[in-house]
C-alpha cells in the first residue's frame, strides 16, 4: 500500500526542526538544507519506463510503515 | 547511473603518505556524501570517513590524526591522503556514496589493493 | 561508537535451504521512527552490494528471496531459498550515526 510522505519525527529523538518545502533534513548535520544537496531521488518523467537516475533505492512489497519509498525525500518535514 | 573508480599507487612505502583519488561520474560531488572504506586482506569493512556537498569533512577517531579528505570539484573527484602508513594500513580502500533520507550506501568503487612495504 | 556482532561468523547450508543471519547493535540504530541498519553481500574480488536499507527494503534489482526485519538492537537477514549464487560473506552495517561501522561479517558457505 503507498502511503503518504512521512517525516524523521519519531519517539527516539527530539523531532527536528520542521523544514520549509523544497529543503531536507539532514540527519548528520541535524538541520534542514536544500533537497539538492542530498541525494534526493528524483522523480521519473511521465512515461519513463527505465529506472530514477541517482538511486538505487526501492521498497519493498509489504513496506512496514515509514519505510519505503513514499518516505523520500522528506522535503517538508511535516 | 552513479560510478566510482578510485585511483592510485598499489603500492606505498612505510611512513610515507597513501594517496588515492574517486572519480565520480552521473552525479555531482556537490551533492551528497563521499566516502572511504577499507578492508583489511581477509577482514571486516572500516569506515574511514567522508567529504559533504558542502566540503565538510568527518574522519573516523581510529584514523583521525593521520586522515585528509579533499575534493576536486571542477574534476567531480575527491581524495584521501592517510599519513605516516604502516603494514597495518594494507587493504582495499573503497569510495562509496549513501542515498537520503537512510544513508545506505548504494554506490560503490570497486575498490583498489594498496600494500604498505618497502 | 555503536558496535555491530554478527551471527553465527559462518553459516553452513545447501542450495534451497533457508539462512538466517543475525546482527545486534550495542545501542538503538532507531531514530526519527526509522531503523537506520542495512545489509550487504560481497563476494571475492568484489566491493560490497547494498542487499536491504532501513531493516527492511530491498535495494534496485536484489530478488525477493533476500528480506530484512528488526528495529531497535535485534536484526535479521533472511534468505528464503539459497541459490548458488548467494554463496557470500553478508555486513550489516549502521547509518544512524558517525562513525558508520559494519558487524564483523556472516560467510554463508556451502555445506
Known amino acids: 500500500m503507498r502511503r503518504g510522505p512521512r517525516s524523521l519525527r519519531g519517539r527516539d529523538a527530539p523531532a527536528p526542526t520542521p523544514c520549509v518545502p523544497a529543503e531536507c533534513f539532514d540527519l548528520l548535520v541535524r538541520h534542514c538544507v536544500a533537497c539538492g544537496l542530498l541525494r534526493t531521488p528524483r522523480p521519473k518523467p511521465a512515461g519513463a519506463s527505465s529506472p530514477a537516475p541517482r538511486t538505487a533505492l526501492q521498497p519493498q512489497e509489504s513496506v512496514g510503515a515509514g519505510a519505503g519509498e513514499a518516505a523520500l525525500p522528506l522535503p517538508g518535514l511535516l | 547511473q552513479v560510478q566510482l573508480q578510485e585511483s592510485g599507487p598499489g603500492l606505498v612505502k612505510p611512513s610515507q603518505t597513501l594517496s588515492l583519488t574517486c572519480t565520480v561520474s552521473?552525479?555531482?560531488?556537490?551533492?551528497?556524501?563521499w566516502n572511504w572504506i577499507r578492508q583489511h586482506p581477509g577482514k571486516g569493512l572500516e569506515y574511514i570517513g567522508y567529504i559533504s556537498y558542502s566540503g565538510s569533512t568527518y574522519y573516523n577517531p581510529s584514523l583521525k590524526s593521520r586522515v585528509t579528505i579533499s575534493r576536486d570539484t571542477s574534476k567531480n573527484q575527491f581524495s584521501l591522503k592517510l599519513s605516516s602508513v604502516t603494514a597495518a594500513d594494507t587493504a582495499v580502500y573503497y569510495c562509496?556514496?549513501?542515498?537520503?533520507?537512510?544513508?545506505?550506501?548504494?554506490?560503490w568503487g570497486q575498490g583498489t589493493l594498496v600494500t604498505v612495504s618497502s | 561508537d555503536i558496535v555491530l556482532t554478527q551471527s553465527p561468523a559462518t553459516l553452513s547450508l545447501s542450495p534451497g535451504e533457508r539462512a538466517t543471519l543475525s546482527c545486534r547493535a550495542s545501542e538503538s540504530v532507531d531514530n526519527y521512527g526509522i531503523s537506520f541498519m542495512n545489509w550487504f553481500q560481497q563476494k571475492p574480488g568484489q566491493a560490497p552490494r547494498l542487499l536491504i536499507y532501513a531493516a527492511s527494503n530491498r535495494a534496485t534489482g536484489i530478488p525477493a528471496r533476500f528480506s530484512g526485519s528488526g528495529s531497535g538492537t535485534d536484526f535479521t537477514l533472511t534468505i528464503s531459498s539459497l541459490e548458488p549464487e548467494d554463496f557470500a560473506v553478508y555486513y550489516c552495517?549502521?547509518?544512524?550515526?558517525?562513525?558508520?561501522?559494519f558487524g564483523g561479517g556472516t560467510k554463508v558457505e556451502i555445506k
Open positions: 552495517q549502521q547509518s544512524k550515526e558517525v562513525p558508520w561501522t
Open positions: 552521473g552525479d555531482s560531488i556537490t551533492s551528497g556524501y
Open positions: 562509496a556514496s549513501p542515498n537520503y533520507p537512510f544513508y545506505a550506501m548504494d554506490y
